[in-house]
């Protein structure tokens, strides 16, 4: 059956927008006027997962790219990738784990768990211009709230 | 507290076809799936497959070309043909339903339906 | 067609602990769920999505997945939950039972 799906993109919560860097990365930076659409637009997808009042499993694909943010071990490290799939197949209504973020609604801030790895949050630096990460810390430096904007289709 | 109740012919001969309904009591209907399931005699569970309420489906494979599942929201009611049965589809079938709250697994099941496939 | 493996029976004593392993390949990338079966009865979710129990499951029911094979622990077992258990999990687009442990 059809995974339900809407787009949108992210900011974190110093307001920097995700845009591509090289064909398989993110990063974080301050976007005003014309640039703002360089930002990345995601296609969030509802999928399988735990799903309560606050917490809903979500899928993150490049709009009209066959790309997906995953998280897999590197290093013995969880690590934030996008993950190019087979468009045929994808998006799912279950999505391997890997695939998998608990959006986590919490004083009007999103929150990305990765299911795979909990406790481990898509991230943001501080700093400007820095790759879109994997974090294990929450209430640190890095940024781990996030703001969604929709975009019609 | 939700409930399945399912019915249907329980001795069918080979070439016939299966036909099962499945009542659900309680509960939205259009914010689930919709399984069926069968066990041969001593034998494990095998998945069937799946409706939602705007009738999209998924089947197993293995049974895809014999297999209708179809819904009636009206009613809330779903309902499984298997035609050109055999003597291997004797088995004890159960509809399911499948919820967010528990990952969109099998969390509610009916009592099961005995059918006997025999000349 | 995707396969879950599942010893088809496992023994203790009560009071001890069972575990009941199912195998597949890549499973730990997938959610795996377990269900349990009494005789001429219809099965009842004690495992989802790994590691969760459902409300009224006992705390001694708990489950991990990682690799290629998922784990039901029932730790300090008695005579009641003496049962078939089922894995099931995906695969692509349709589901997927373990053959079953006594």
């Known amino acids: 059956a059809p995974v339900r799906s809407l787009n949108c993109t992210l900011r974190d919560s110093q307001q920097k927008s995700l845009v591509m860097s090289g064909p398989y990365e993110l990063k974080a930076l301050h976007l005003q006027g014309q640039d703002m659409e360089q930002q990345v637009v995601f296609s969030m997808s509802f999928v399988q997962g735990e799903e309560s009042n606050d917490k809903i499993p979500v899928a993150l694909g490049l709009k009209e790219k066959n790309l997906y943010l995953s998280c897999v071990l590197k290093d013995d490290k969880p690590t934030l990738q996008l993950e190019s799939v087979d468009p045929k197949n994808y998006p799912k209504k279950k999505m391997e784990k890997r695939f998998v973020f608990n959006k986590i609604e919490i004083n009007n801030k999103l929150e990305f768990e990765s299911a795979q790895f909990p406790n481990w949050y898509i991230s943001t630096s501080q700093a400007e211009n820095m790759p879109v990460f994997l974090g294990g810390t929450k209430g640190g430096q890095d940024i781990t709230d996030f703001t969604m904007q929709f975009v019609s289709s | 507290q939700v409930q399945l109740q399912q019915w249907g012919a329980g001795l069918l001969k080979p070439s016939e076809t299966l036909s099962l309904t499945c009542a659900v009591y309680?509960?939205?209907?259009?914010?689930?799936?919709w399984s069926w399931i069968r066990q041969p005699p001593g034998k494990g569970l095998e998945w069937i497959g799946e409706?939602?309420?705007?009738?999209?489906?998924n089947y197993n494979p293995s049974l895809k070309s014999r297999v209708t599942i179809s819904v009636d929201t009206s009613k809330n009611q779903f309902s499984l043909k298997l035609s050109s049965v055999t003597a291997a589809d004797t088995a004890v079938y159960y509809c399911?339903?499948?919820?967010?709250?528990?990952?969109?697994?099998?969390?509610?099941w009916g009592q099961g339906t005995l059918v006997t496939v025999s000349s | 067609q995707s396969v879950l493996t599942q010893p088809p029976s496992v023994s203790v004593s009560p009071g001890q602990t069972a575990s009941i392993t199912c195998s597949g390949d890549?499973?730990?990338?997938?959610?795996a769920f377990w269900y349990q079966q009494k005789p001429g009865q219809s099965p009842v979710l004690v495992i989802y999505?790994?590691?969760k129990r459902p409300s009224g499951i006992p705390e001694r029911f708990s489950g991990s997945n990682s690799g290629n094979t998922a784990t039901l622990t029932i730790s300090g077992t008695q005579a009641l939950d003496e049962a078939d258990y089922y894995c099931?999990?995906?695969?692509?687009?349709?589901?997927?039972f373990g053959g079953g442990t006594k």
């Open positions: 399911a339903r499948a919820s967010p709250s528990s990952g969109w697994t099998l969390d509610y």
């Open positions: 099931y999990a995906w695969a692509d687009t349709y589901e997927v």
């Open positions: 409706i939602d309420h705007s009738g999209s489906t």
């Open positions: 309680g509960g939205s209907f259009s914010d689930y799936y």
């Open positions: 890549k499973l730990g990338d997938k959610f």
């Open positions: 999505l790994d590691n």
